[in-house]
């Protein structure tokens, strides 16, 4: 399934390539990337009714058209559900050992820069992606993944670490962002919202998606994460938005079906190996890329973010399971575990495809506002 564009329908790309139509120019957030109504209970603010999108922010509802079994970022989803009237007591602080440096949480104290000064850096993540302002970089080739189809044995550790659910990945999962840009996958984790409240970390034109998966990689130039932290390109994260669809996602079900076992913070279980690439969109050729940071303390910068243009479809029940099963500290549900979008501060998001070119009948001249910085790579 894929949703039509927020503007008016326009034809798909030529031939059988199944190419997608980019987002329109209307309703772009402000240049400054300042927090919008959809911004989360990140380190700055607690969740509240003001975090909900206003009616004027809601895209109009369009019927679905037949195509591939996942959405595209250009085709923004329909309406956001109304907010949860009851505020989740998200990540209430369990102060077992005083205000230790590592005791950060989503929303409220301590401010993240006090936990780690890097959290006040100029090039932080997540960010709001505005396809119209993305620089089309033909040099950005399709991502290459090798060894991501894991056998059932050895089993993998799935853990509720109090901030997210994390799957530890074994050695041998290789990923290349391009020639000479090689990485090894270390772990994956998810970010989500609460009932009726989306919880992706990145946003697209201010729109927040239900959830987001992050697959974290270490550059092969480094032997350990410590060495790579803060170094440009030392870490790379593949990110994809999770969206509601009509069918159960069998790949995700292998993980979601085990969440009850790790409902308690700090608990873990073993799950059979699975095809990790099946948790990601199928189109590895169309993505956005920028340099940012870890989205949790210590917020180290230099992280290469690759955000897929295509989204992954989960059923409504699966999204509910994700957001309503795990518990965090202080006997509170683990929900709304996403950071507020951060200012770009002059960064240009690159796109592997002409995301800013509007092919709809309304656009007389294609517009590309930024040029590719990586053309010579």
């Amino acid at each position: 399934q894929r949703l039509p564009r927020m503007q008016e329908d326009s034809p798909l790309g030529g031939g059988s390539s199944g190419e997608d139509d980019p987002l329109g120019e209307e309703d772009l957030p402000s240049e400054e990337d300042s927090p919008r109504e959809e911004d989360p209970p990140g380190e700055e603010d607690l969740p509240g009714e003001e975090d909900l999108p206003g009616e004027e922010d809601l895209p109009e509802v369009k019927p679905k058209s037949e195509e591939e079994g996942s959405l595209k970022l250009e085709d923004l989803p329909t309406v956001e559900a109304p907010g949860d009237p009851q505020e989740p007591q998200n990540n209430a602080h369990r102060d077992k050992e005083g205000d230790d440096q590592s005791h950060w949480r989503y929303g409220g104290d301590p401010p993240w820069p006090r936990v780690s000064p890097a959290c006040a850096g100029r090039f932080q993540s997540p960010v709001d992606i505005r396809p119209q302002l993305a620089a089309f970089c033909p040099a950005l080739r399709p991502l290459e993944l090798l060894g991501f189809q894991l056998p059932p044995l050895p089993e993998l550790r799935l853990r509720n670490n109090g901030h997210s659910v994390q799957l530890t990945l074994p050695p041998g999962l290789e990923m290349a962002l391009g020639p000479g840009r090689e990485y090894r996958a270390l772990q994956l984790h998810l970010h989500w919202g609460a009932a009726g409240r989306p919880g992706s970390e990145h946003t697209v034109e201010g729109h927040r998606f239900p959830a987001e998966i992050h697959v974290v990689h270490l550059s092969t130039a480094f032997a350990r994460v410590d060495e790579a932290l803060g170094r440009p390109g030392g870490l790379a994260v593949l990110a994809a938005f999770l969206e509601e669809g009509p069918e159960e996602n069998s790949a995700y079900e292998q993980l979601l079906s085990r969440l009850e076992e790790i409902a308690e913070e700090g608990s873990e279980t073993q799950v059979p190996g699975l095809d990790i690439s099946a948790l990601l969109p199928s189109d590895f050729s169309r993505y956005f890329q920028y340099e940012g940071s870890l989205t949790t303390p210590p917020c180290a910068q230099g992280v290469i973010w690759t955000v897929f243009n295509q989204t992954v479809m989960l059923s409504a029940k699966q999204l509910h399971t994700l957001s309503d099963t795990l518990w965090g500290p202080g006997d509170s549900r683990l929900q709304l575990n996403f950071r507020a979008t951060q200012p770009l501060n002059g960064r240009v998001i690159e796109a592997s495809f002409p995301a800013g070119v509007d092919s709809s009948p309304r656009a007389a001249e294609p517009v590309q506002l930024n040029s590719c910085l990586a053309a010579g790579d």
């Epitope: 077992k96 590592s102 500290p329």
Partner: nanobody, 114 residues
């Protein structure tokens, strides 16, 4: 790799106590979930206890009430106090540090025998 150095293993009589320690050489120690796992001959490695960055602890049912895990972020050390030891606690005990990466120590032998 992140260096995890275990110590404190040895031979102890049933009902006795041991304290295992693990020191990590990592600048991101505070953000790690730390754990102890064990592997007896012919068995798979199994969870003993973990402690998150927020000092939330989790224990295997078989050691609850007998073992206590703790961490000292300043010293970059995670410890496992093992009381009322039983012969079935005999195994190689491994220290684990997990955050972005997943790192293991070399293991220390614990033998409970009379």
């Amino acid at each position: 790799q992140v260096q995890l150095q275990e110590s404190g293993g040895g031979l102890v009589q049933p009902g006795g106590s041991l304290r295992l320690s693990c020191t990590a050489s990592t600048s991101s120690f505070n953000f790690q979930t730390l754990g102890w796992y064990r592997q007896a001959p012919g068995n798979q490695r199994e969870l003993v206890a973990t402690i998150t960055s927020r000092a939330i602890t989790n224990y295997a049912d078989s050691v609850k009430g007998r073992f206590t895990i703790s961490r000292d972020n300043a010293a970059k050390t995670v410890s496992l106090q093992m009381n009322s030891l039983k012969p079935e606690d005999t195994a190689v005990y491994y220290c684990n540090a997990a955050w972005i990466g997943d790192y293991w120590g070399q293991g220390t032998q614990v033998t409970v025998s009379s």
